[in-house]
C-alpha cells in the first residue's frame, strides 16, 4: 500500500500505535492535530520504535517529509547531547535512538527549529523551520492495552473492519488499542460488532468471544438475549433492548448505563464503561475523578493568548498590552493601528506565530525594565532575580481601589515552557482517556513544587481570598511554597446563571475588583502599601505538599522565579503601589478588614505545564527546561492579566504599561 495515499494509516503494537497522516501541515498544526486525536507527535526513542515507524512510512519519495515530535527553541543548542538541544513534545530529552541526517555543526542556533523525517531511504531526521508546511506528520498514541486482531472465521464475508479511538479505519491491524471497535460481516448477512474492553480479570480483550458467524435461533433461552431476541431470515439472532436501555458490550444483556453513573454534570450511554461522563462548556473532568468536573484554566495552557490571559469559571479572555491591539483571531496582538485588528470571537483554525527569536527583541523590553505597571485586580510578577525569601500570606483587600505593582523585567521564554499552543476542539467534554492522561502532569518531583488545585466547591465571590506565593529556586525544598493553581468548581456564584453562556460568559462585576489594604487617597492618586504580615493574617506557608486551605478556593498567584535579587527581610516585605482614578464599584459592600474578599479570577501568564511533568518551573538550579511547541512569534513583552480594560496608569519615572484591548473567548481547550 502506498503510504502516500490520501488516507492515513497506522501500525499498532501491544501498547502504542503510530499513525501517518499525509496532510500538509506546519509543525504547530501537526502537533495540534495529534493532540486533538488524543495522541502526540511521534517520539521514536528506541531502535524498536524507529523500526515500527520505518515500516509504517515505507519507501516514499525523497521530496516527502513528515513531522515528528522534536523541537528546539532558539539558542538552545547542546550539540554534545544526542538530541542536540531538541526536546520531545512530551517534554523530555530522553532517547536511546537518533537518526540525524548530518553530524552536528557548531552554529549559533539563532532560531527555533523543528524536526522532520525523510519519507525515503533511511528516514533520516532533518531540522528546519517550524513554519514550513511539510507533507505530513506522524502521531503516536499510547494506551493501557491492546486486543489482538481477530482471527478470520469460515463464515465471514470479509476481513474485520477496525475503527481505532483515533478514528482510523482499516482491516490491516495486528493490534487494536483499547477502545477500538471491530465490525465483522458474516456471509449469512448478519454481522457482529465487538469492542476492545477492559476485562474483569484484568487486561483487555474483545467484548465477546467467537465464533461470531454461527446461527442458533431464538429458542431455547431467548437466544441468550436479556430483552428481545430477533430471529433473522438466515436463522441468526440479534438481541435488542427496550426503550431507554442499551445493548451491553456482550451483545445480549441490556443496561441503563446512566442509572448508576455518578456523573456530576452530564451522562451519556456508551463508552467502555457503558456510560461516559461529560462536562459542560468550560469545565473538564477532575484529574483524580473523571466523574467530577472542574473549571478549565485555559491560561495554564500554553499559547492560549499571545500576551495576556484572564481565566474565570467557564471562560477566558485574551488581552494585549498598551499600544497593541488584539487581532481578529482573539489571540494574537499587533502594534496598535498596524493591522486594524478587532477583538473577535471567531474561533477559526487560527495559526499562532512561529515564536522564532529575533535578535532585536530586547529593545521592546527597555521601556518596561523595572517600571511600574497598573494591574487592577491582579498580583503577578516574574522578576529575573528573586529575593531571598519565601512568603505566602493572605491580606484582606478593600474593594474600592485599583492597585499598581512593580513589574520587573520578566524572563522570557519562561524556564519551563509547556506545549505552546493548544488545539481548538468542537468537543466540549473530555471522554478520551488518552487525552486526559496526556495533558495532566504526573506527581511532582522533589525539586518541582506541586500544583495544588482547589477541588472543594468554590465559595461565593464574597469569600474568595487571594494568596500571594513566592517561589524561589535558591531555597531548600522544604521552604519552597507550592504554587497554588486554582480550579473553580462547577458551582457558579449566586448572581450568575448556572450554565456559563457559550457566548460572552459573564465577566466580573465591578464591585468584585480586589484591592490592596492601607490605601490612602491623595487627589486622584491612590497610594497603596502592602504591609508586613499583620497579626490578623496568619501566614500561609505553602511548602511542598501543602494543601490549599478550604477558605481560599481562588488563590491568586504572585510568582517570582529567578536567582539573585537583594535580600528582603521576610518579616516585613512591603509593596508600594500607585494608581490613578480608581474604579468605583457598582455597589460597595462593607466587610470587616480581616475577612474582606478579593474576588479574583485565576490570573496567570500564558504558559502551561509541560506534559507529564509538574507545571511549575523547576526550582532546582540544575533542572533542565524543556521547550515544547511554541510558534507564537515574538514573545509577549508583558504578562499582565486583567479582568477588564485597564484604566490609564499613572506615569512614573520608570515607564508605564497598560492593556489596550482584550477579547472575550469562551471556547475551551480540552
Amino acid at each position: 500500500q502506498d503510504p502516500w495515499a490520501a488516507e492515513p494509516r497506522a501500525a499498532c503494537g501491544p501498547s502504542s500505535c503510530y499513525a501517518l497522516f499525509p496532510r500538509r501541515r506546519t509543525f504547530l498544526e501537526a502537533w495540534r492535530a495529534c493532540r486533538e486525536l488524543g495522541g502526540d507527535l511521534a517520539t521514536p526513542r528506541t531502535p524498536e520504535e524507529a523500526q515500527r515507524v520505518d515500516s509504517l512510512v515505507g519507501a516514499g519519495p525523497a521530496s516527502r517529509l513528515l513531522w515528528i515530535g522534536l523541537q528546539r527553541q532558539a539558542r538552545q543548542c547542546q550539540l554534545q547531547r544526542p538530541l542536540r538541544g531538541f526536546t520531545w513534545t512530551t517534554g523530555d530529552q530522553d532517547t536511546a535512538f537518533t537518526n540525524w541526517a548530518q553530524p552536528a555543526s557548531g552554529g549559533p542556533c539563532p532560531a527555533q527549529r523543528c524536526v522532520a523525517l525523510e519519507a525515503s531511504g533511511e528516514h533520516r531526521w532533518l531540522e528546519g523551520s517550524c513554519t514550513l508546511a511539510v507533507d505530513g506528520y506522524l502521531c503516536q498514541f499510547g494506551f493501557e492495552g491492546a486486543c489482538p486482531a481477530l482471527q478470520d472465521e469460515a463464515g465471514q464475508a470479509g476481513p474485520a473492519v477496525y475503527t481505532t479511538p483515533f478514528h482510523l479505519v482499516s482491516t490491516e491491524f495486528e493490534w487494536l488499542p483499547f477502545g477500538s471497535v471491530a465490525a465483522v460481516q458474516c456471509q449469512a448477512g448478519r454481522g457482529a460488532s465487538l469492542l476492545c474492553v477492559k476485562q474483569p480479570e484484568g487486561g483487555v480483550g474483545w467484548s465477546r468471544a467467537g465464533p461470531l458467524c454461527l446461527g442458533t435461533g431464538c429458542s431455547p433461552d431467548n437466544g441468550g438475549c436479556e430483552h428481545e431476541c430477533v430471529e433473522e431470515v438466515d436463522g441468526h439472532v440479534s438481541c435488542r433492548c427496550t426503550e431507554g436501555f442499551r445493548l451491553a458490550a456482550d451483545g445480549r444483556s441490556c443496561e441503563d448505563p446512566c442509572a448508576q453513573a455518578p456523573c456530576e454534570q452530564q451522562c451519556e450511554p456508551g463508552g467502555p464503561q457503558g456510560y461516559s461522563c461529560h462536562c459542560r462548556l468550560g469545565f473538564r473532568p477532575a484529574e483524580d475523578d473523571p466523574h467530577r468536573c472542574v473549571d478549565t484554566d485555559e491560561c495554564q495552557i500554553a499559547g492560549v493568548c499571545q500576551q495576556m490571559c484572564v481565566n474565570y469559571v467557564g471562560g477566558f479572555e485574551c488581552y494585549c498590552s498598551e499600544g497593541h491591539e488584539l487581532e481578529a483571531d482573539g489571540i494574537s496582538c499587533s502594534p496598535a493601528g498596524a493591522m486594524g485588528a478587532q477583538a473577535s470571537q471567531d474561533l477559526g483554525d487560527e495559526l499562532l506565530d512561529d515564536g522564532e527569536d529575533e535578535e532585536d527583541e530586547d529593545e521592546a523590553w527597555k521601556a518596561f525594565n523595572g517600571g511600574w505597571t497598573e494591574m487592577p485586580g491582579i498580583l503577578w510578577m516574574e522578576p529575573t532575580q528573586p529575593p531571598d525569601f519565601a512568603l505566602a500570606y493572605r491580606p484582606s483587600f478593600p474593594e474600592d481601589r485599583e492597585p499598581q505593582i512593580p513589574y520587573p523585567e520578566p524572563t522570557w521564554p519562561p524556564p519551563l515552557s509547556a506545549p505552546r499552543v493548544p488545539y481548538h476542539s468542537s468537543v466540549l467534554s473530555v471522554t478520551r482517556p488518552v487525552v486526559v492522561s496526556a495533558t495532566h502532569p504526573t506527581l511532582p518531583s522533589a525539586h518541582q513544587p506541586p500544583v495544588i488545585p482547589a477541588t472543594h466547591p468554590a465559595l461565593s465571590r464574597d469569600h474568595q481570598i487571594p494568596v500571594i506565593a513566592a517561589n524561589y529556586p535558591d531555597l531548600p525544598s522544604a521552604y519552597q511554597p507550592g504554587i497554588l493553581s486554582v480550579s473553580h468548581s462547577a458551582q457558579p456564584p449566586a448572581h450568575q446563571p448556572p450554565m456559563i453562556s457559550t457566548k460572552y460568559p459573564e465577566l466580573f462585576p465591578a464591585h468584585q475588583s480586589p484591592m490592596f489594604p492601607d490605601t490612602r487617597v491623595a487627589g486622584t492618586q491612590t497610594t497603596t502599601h502592602l504591609p508586613g504580615i499583620p497579626p490578623n493574617h496568619a501566614p500561609l506557608v505553602t511548602t511542598l505538599g501543602a494543601q490549599l486551605p478550604p477558605q481560599a478556593p481562588d488563590a491568586l498567584v504572585l510568582r517570582t522565579q529567578a536567582t539573585q535579587l537583594p535580600i528582603i527581610p521576610t518579616a516585613q516585605p512591603s509593596l508600594t503601589t500607585t494608581s490613578r482614578s480608581p474604579v468605583s464599584p457598582a455597589h460597595q459592600i462593607s466587610v470587616p478588614a480581616a475577612t474582606q474578599p478579593a474576588a479574583l479570577p485565576t490570573l496567570l501568564p500564558s504558559q502551561s505545564p509541560t506534559n507529564q511533568t509538574s507545571p511549575i518551573s523547576p526550582t532546582h538550579p540544575h533542572s533542565k527546561a524543556p521547550q515544547i511547541p511554541r510558534e507564537d512569534g515574538p514573545s509577549p513583552k508583558l504578562a499582565l492579566w486583567l479582568p477588564s480594560p485597564a484604566p490609564t496608569a499613572a506615569p512614573t519615572a520608570l515607564g508605564e504599561a497598560g492593556l489596550a484591548e482584550h477579547s472575550q473567548r469562551d471556547d475551551r481547550w480540552l
Partner: antibody, heavy 124, light 108 residues
Amino acid sequence: QVQLQESGPGLVRPSQTLSLTCTASGYTFTDYVIHWVKQPPGRGLEWIGYINPYDDDTTYNQKFKGRVTMLVDTSSNTAYLRLSSVTAEDTAVYYCARRGNSYDGYFDYSMDYWGQGSLVTVSS
Amino acid sequence: DIQMTQSPSSLSASVGDRVTITCRASQNVGTAVAWLQQTPGKAPKLLIYSASNRYTGVPSRFSGSGSGTDYTFTISSLQPEDIATYYCQQYTNYPMYTFGQGTKVQIK
C-alpha cells in the same frame, strides 16, 4: 549536474493559450517539486504555482487560478505550463525552478535551481 | 497573502563597501526566507536559504539573518561581480510563495 530548460513559442496572440515546457535533467525528477515563476520585463518575480511530479499535486497562485494548468510527464522528465486567455499583461520571462528538499541536514523549500527563462510576448 | 517589503529599492556603493538590504514580512514566516541574486539577463540564483544558511558554493561575503518578520541580507565587501538585483522570498505560507520587490545594487 542539475539542469532545467524552458522552451516554448516566443509569441502568443491575445486570448490564446500560452504553452511552455520545462525539461529537467541531472536528478530524479519525481523527487522534487517544480515551480513556475513569471517576470514581466523590467519588473520583479511573481510566483505562479507548483506541481509535484510524484503525485501530480498542484498548487496555484490565486491570481492565476482558472487560467493556469500545470502537468508533468515523468517518462520524459518534463513539466508543462499552460496559461489561457492571455493578454499583454502576460508578456514576461517565464522560469521553471526546482524546489529544494534538504541541504546539509536541513530541510528547506527554497528554489535551488532555475531554468534560464523563456520570453513570451503576447501581441496581435 | 504574506507581503514581503524590501528596502531600499536601489543603492549605489563602492567596491569593498558593506551593503545591507532588509526585508520585512507582513506576518511571521519563521526562518523560511531565501535571498536570490539576479544578474541582468540571467535567471535568479539562490544565495541564502532558511534566512541565514549560505547555499552551496556561495562566497562567504554573503550572509543573511533574522527570523519572524525582519530579515537582513549583507554583502560584507562589495565586489564588481555583485552588481545585480537581489530578491528576498518567503516560502512558509503554503501554498503561496512571495517575493520582495527587489533591490538593485550598483557600483559608484
